[in-house]
């Protein structure tokens, strides 16, 4: 079945050294346990996190994200997942793309992370 992938339309903000969540979901909501789900960074498609065959595929990760990411899967049965990145670095700033692949059908959503210096940070909004 077909679906859309939805991510944050507003930039996600994080402080250096903190953790940040990048949420992503499919619509209409459906069980994504059997799908391939991942995040990569354009333009060179460096793998930030990959989930396939019901498991996190740590071996496919770009070295700079090894040990810093966690896929929150408690709502994957509804097609909702979140990538948590720990110990945020300035180099994490920029674009991320989340994708869901169901057999040969794949959709994705782009999102943006803004990283700020904690000594010069003003709460957004």
């Amino acid at each position: 079945g077909q679906f859309r992938v939805i991510g944050p339309r507003h930039p996600i903000r994080a402080l250096v050294g903190d953790e940040v969540e990048l949420p992503c979901r499919i619509s209409p909501g459906k069980n994504a346990t059997g799908m391939e789900v991942g995040w990569y960074r354009p333009p060179f498609s460096r793998v930030v996190h990959l989930y396939r065959n019901g498991k996190d595929q740590d071996g496919d990760q770009a070295p700079e994200y090894r040990g810093r990411t966690e896929l929150l899967k408690d709502a994957i049965g509804e097609g909702k997942v979140t990538l948590r990145i720990r110990n945020v670095r300035f180099s994490d700033e920029g674009g991320f793309t989340c994708f869901f692949r169901d057999h040969s059908y794949q959709e994705e959503a782009a999102m943006e992370l803004k990283v700020e210096d904690p000594f010069y940070w003003v709460s957004p909004g």
């Epitope: 507003h10 940040v20 979140t82």
Partner: antibody
Amino acid sequence: QVQLVESGGGLVQPGGSLRLSCAASGFAFRNYAMNWVRQAPGKGLEWVSAISGSGGSTYYADSVKGRFTISRDNSKNTLYLQMNSLRAEDTAVYYCARDYGGISPFDYWGQGTLVTVSS
Amino acid sequence: DIQLTQSPSSLSASVGDRVTITCRASQGISSALAWYQQKPGKAPKLLIYDASSLESGVPSRFSGSGSGTDFTLTISSLQPEDFATYYCQQFNSYPHTFGQGTKVDIK
């Protein structure tokens, strides 16, 4: 099952302060964004504030910016709303509600707690 | 900020009627729109998300449509328990604004 229970409402004088709490259970609290929504007597719904799962991002309606502070304690599965410099127009039922990462509608709501600002 | 304008603000209908409520956004919000039902003294209940997807457990007589700026909630055959106030909400961007509500009462 998912449950959200608000507390801390009551009668307060204009200019006063109040802290609302929302105790969450039945889900992985730290993995969800949380919101406060209010409803003045006989009026419609007004979104007030939101906070990300980690607490690192917060958002406010213009009507409360600089006066209200949203926070959360993930170790206690509790959401808070610190309300300062209260005005008569802040009188409302305050609901907490969860959403998924700020990219979903509010699928679970608490029962609400009434805040009355009056002298 | 994105404003949502619902119409009508109230309507009277009979059991079995087809009821349509519209919600117009001041700027495009893709499909990031939800519809809620609220009864007096109760918290709102999610009916429709992503403009047209039915929330689990909600009767199929409720449906939503639209994209961009114009959205519709339809109740195909009004039931006694459907007399309530209905709100649209956008979650495209903060602040996550609500429409002013549409009260559906008995004719």
